[in-house]
């Protein structure tokens, strides 16, 4: 499965939109910084097969979409930017779903895929827990926005490596 060039553009657009969504200066939230322990090894496209990489990308975008589709998220961000951001993510999910079916097949996800997917889920669970603990404060959301920009950058790099493999 060849991810269309539009997929990569969509990822870049999503990153730009997420950058524009910032409402407060990150410097005013330095005390709220948190290490969410991004599973960097899951974004190393050299260490696993294409099917596994696509599964990781899909889970990453799905969890990002879920995170920004909550009521708490709606209250935190400017509505039109949030809608555009969600639309970009939704389009990427559609692109990736076609690839997941083609690459991984409709059979049960292999063990390695499962392990990578669970690493991504645990990462997002930590982000969600952090927001709950900080009562969805503006600074908590700002820290999370910066973290998701970082994880989307990892996703973009993984996509680039996938295309080079093709």
């Amino acid at each position: 499965c060849d991810l269309p060039q539009t997929h990569s553009l969509g990822n870049r657009r999503a990153l730009i939109l997420l950058g524009q969504m910032g409402r407060i200066s990150p410097f005013s939230c330095l005390k709220d910084r948190h290490d969410f322990r991004i599973p960097q090894e899951e974004f190393d496209g050299n260490q696993f097969q294409k099917a596994q990489a696509i599964s990781v990308l899909h889970e990453m975008i799905q969890q990002t979409f879920n995170l920004f589709s909550t009521e708490d998220s709606s209250a935190a961000w400017e509505q039109s930017l949030l809608e555009k951001f969600s639309t970009e993510l939704y389009q990427q999910l559609n692109d990736l779903e076609a690839c997941v079916i083609q690459e991984v097949g409709v059979e049960e996800t292999p063990l390695m895929n499962e392990d990578s997917i669970l690493a991504v889920r645990k990462y997002f669970q930590r982000i969600t827990l952090y927001l709950i603990e900080r009562k969805y404060s503006p600074c908590a959301w700002e820290v999370v926005r910066a973290e998701i920009m970082r994880s989307l950058s990892f996703s973009t790099n993984l996509q680039k490596r996938l295309r080079r493999k093709d």
Epitope: N66, D115, L118, R121, Q125
Partner: antibody, heavy 122, light 107 residues
Framework: EVQLVQAGAEVKAPGESLRISCKVS????????ISWVRQIPGKGLEWMVK????????IYNPSFQGHVSISVDKSITTVYLQWSSLQASDTAIYYC???????????????WGQGTLVAVSS | DIQMTQSPSSLSASVGDSVTITCRAS??????FHWYRQKPGKAPELLIY???NLQTGVPSRFTGSGSGTECTLTITSLQPDDFATYYC?????????FGQGTKLDVR
């Protein structure tokens, strides 16, 4: 086959220290949270603490924080629960459990160890 | 903490009967409700997760429903193996909490 095999029963005196173990096999150890659950004989279940074996990130039930500690040894795929000073009220069966995490980030306990009975008595 | 209250605390039934156990949470837990069965002298085992999903290998006579603050476990056509204690659990908020248990015994 997923297995969580716990150490045998322990009889201890108040004030003693203790570490009980849970050896897991049949899956990738670092992929799933592991929790400990307490059951006082004839009573209900209480969740104590969970750990991510990947990096030892832990979340405690405040009721148990400071009294017990959880740790892992990745090299032998084993999770531990430790007390530095046991009390009579720690007498219970302790279960280690594996969490599954769904796409909507719902945790549930899909595999349980057989339990370790800890009896604390003078 | 989120309190989980099961009702009834105990009930008697016969093989072949149907029974329903209810669990109420002190605040909404969405669908983060799970049900476990514990046979005497054994570890608990998962029956239902996320309120209504049957765990692999669990017979279809077990069904779960509900969300928010209330969920139910229904067992149809009771088998001898089903006489045990049943626990509900929430994993929506920390600390995770269980109901006090419902003991199902033979009438």
């Amino acid at each position: 086959e997923v297995q969580l095999v716990q150490a045998g029963a322990e009889v201890k005196a108040p004030g003693e220290s203790l570490r009980i173990s849970c050896k897991v096999s049949g899956y990738t150890f670092t992929s799933y949270w592991i929790s400990w659950v307490r059951q006082i004989p004839g009573k209900g279940l209480e969740w104590m603490v969970k750990i991510d074996p990947r990096d030892s990130y832990t979340i405690y039930n405040p009721s148990f924080q400071g009294h017990v500690s959880i740790s892992v040894d990745k090299s032998i795929t084993t999770v531990y629960l430790q007390w530095s000073s046991l009390q009579a009220s720690d007498t219970a069966i302790y279960y280690c459990v594996r969490h599954y995490l769904t796409q909507s980030l719902v945790d549930y306990f899909d595999h349980w160890g057989q339990g370790t009975l800890v009896a604390v008595s003078s | 903490d989120i309190q989980m209250t099961q009702s009834p605390s105990s009930l008697s039934a016969s093989v072949g009967d149907s029974v329903t156990i209810t669990c109420r949470a002190s605040q909404s837990v969405s669908n983060y409700f799970h049900w476990y069965r514990q046979k005497p002298g054994k570890a608990p085992e998962l029956l239902i997760y996320s309120a209504s999903n049957l765990q692999t290998g669990v017979p279809s006579r077990f069904t779960g429903s509900g969300s928010g603050t209330e969920c139910t476990l229904t067992i149809t056509s009771l088998q001898p193996d089903d006489f045990a204690t049943y626990y509900c659990q929430q994993t929506h908020g920390y600390p995770f909490t269980f109901g006090q248990g419902t003991k199902l015994d033979v009438r």
